[in-house]
């Protein structure tokens, strides 16, 4: 038998993916478990196999359709269950009535690129990926720049309170290597959280012109 404290957390990427993590203290590592998704008003259902990510937690992705298809709407409620095999039977370990657009985590921004770089500033753009058209412009971004000799955790956060897919970094040091990351979050959703950080974009500022003050 499996007992102990259970935690079952899922997020919708706003298009065609629900990612879930289930953690259970005292769970058996070799138990076969799945997440089952049953929307309240749709003809389809979906299952994914939970795979271990640590000693007592498992994760899986419910793929609902092609990446950019709008598979759930603002009024859908999805019953999500963790089912684990016990011999020849399946036992329900966790259940939740999941409101997709109250539990959002978008994909990390992609296609980061340097639009223009100078000695002291750099203009960077990016794109959002697999984000619903539902949000219109009601998204916010956080960005951070990694300076030499510092860690990402030390980097101050810059907040963009609107759907602005570019930033102009100022007061940079000439001829210096930097890295840049950005993440996105919709305003919608009580339990919505930030996307993962984008892949870092490395760039170098231009050297100061010789014989000029910098």
């Amino acid at each position: 038998a499996v007992n102990g404290t259970s935690r079952f957390t899922c997020f919708y990427n706003s298009r065609a993916n629900i990612s879930c993590v289930w953690s259970q203290d005292g769970a058996l590592q070799d138990t076969s478990c799945q997440v089952h998704a049953w929307p309240d008003r749709r003809r389809w259902n979906q299952t994914c196999e939970l795979l271990p990510v640590s000693q007592a937690s498992w994760a899986c992705n419910l793929i609902l359709g092609t990446p950019d298809s709008q598979k759930l709407t603002a009024v859908d409620i999805v019953t999500l269950r963790v089912m684990c095999r016990e011999g020849v039977r399946w036992r329900m370990m966790a259940i939740q009535d999941f409101k997709p657009f109250e539990n959002l985590r978008l994909m990390a921004p992609i296609s980061l690129q340097v639009v223009h770089v100078e000695t002291h500033r750099c203009n960077i753009s990016w794109k959002i990926s697999q984000a619903s058209h539902y949000f219109e412009r009601h998204l916010e971004f956080e960005a951070r720049t990694l300076s030499p000799g510092h860690t990402w955790e030390e980097a101050p956060l810059m907040t963009l309170k609107q759907k602005q897919e570019w930033i102009c970094l100022e007061t940079l040091t000439p001829d210096t290597q930097y890295e840049f990351q950005v993440r996105v979050k919709p305003l919608q959703g009580e339990f919505t959280t930030w996307s993962p950080w984008s892949q870092p974009l490395a760039f170098r500022t231009k050297p100061a012109a010789l014989g000029k003050d910098t």
Partner: antibody, heavy 117, light 107 residues
Framework: EVQLVQSGAEVKKPGATVKISCKVS????????VHWVQQAPGKGLEWMGW????????EYAPGFQDRVTITADTSTDTAYMELSSLRSEDTAVYYC??????????WGQGTTVTVSS | EIVMTQSPATLSVSPGERATLSCRAS??????LHWYQQKPGQAPRLLII???QSISGIPARFSGSRSGTEFTLTISSLQSEDFAVYFC?????????FGQGTKLEIK
């Protein structure tokens, strides 16, 4: 500039059907939801439903779903709302609006429908 | 269906003064509450989303707040163009529903 331009006022007899159009401009029609809202004198604002032009999916409020049909013509960037089996309490101003599912960012000018025998 | 109750039905305030409009939900709606302004003969106009987020182009004198199921729209210093009817709207449970409106009139 975002604009939603609705068809003109209608006078209908009880039991008839009315169809109102909403021509949109200033944004990508295929990337948007068009909603319909009723504002009747004694009842206030009531959400009727919406259509998602990206995939043609509709959502109707329970109080209207038996009588309302929302459609969209992506070739002309026009949404339509058809209300059947009209009764006197359907006398109202009907608005189309653009927005995500949760709130209405831009509104049409409204279409007055009078139901009278 | 969630019932949205606005109070007062009519509010009389002098220009330059502060106006406080209330909207209460019949059940918990998180921050899924939006405010609109409607002037006679016009369509409603979106002012505030998610309880407190201002829409671009809306003057800074309009602000929103939340305490549990009670939401407040505050207009800090009333201008002549602010006298109108104000509606709240919830988007927590379908069908989305509106309050009956508060008419803000000149005192």
């Amino acid at each position: 500039e975002v604009q939603l331009v609705q068809s003109g006022a209608e006078v209908k007899k009880p039991g008839a059907t009315v169809k109102i159009s909403c021509k949109v401009s200033g944004f990508n029609f295929k990337d948007s939801l068009v909603h319909w809202v009723q504002q009747a004198p004694g009842k206030g604002l009531e959400w009727m439903g919406w259509i998602d032009s990206e995939n043609g999916e509709t959502e109707y409020a329970p109080g209207f779903q038996d009588r309302v049909t929302i459609t969209a013509d992506t070739s002309t960037d026009t949404a339509y709302m058809e209300l059947s089996s009209l009764r006197s309490e359907d006398t109202a101003v009907y608005y189309c609006a653009r927005g995500g599912p949760w709130f209405l960012s831009y509104w049409g000018q409204g279409t007055t429908v009078t139901v009278s025998s | 269906e969630i019932v949205m109750t606005q109070s007062p039905a009519t509010l009389s305030v002098s220009p330059g003064e502060r106006a406080t409009l209330s909207c209460r939900a019949s059940q918990i709606i998180s921050n899924n509450l939006h405010w609109y302004q409607q002037k006679p003969g016009q369509a409603p106009r979106l002012l505030i989303i998610y309880g407190l987020q201002s829409i671009s182009g809306i003057p800074a004198r309009f602000s929103g707040s939340r305490s549990g199921t009670e939401f407040t729209l505050t207009i800090s210093s009333l201008q002549s163009e602010d006298f109108a009817v104000y509606f709240c709207q919830q988007s927590n449970n379908w069908p989305w529903t509106f309050g009956q409106g508060t008419k803000l009139e000149i005192k």
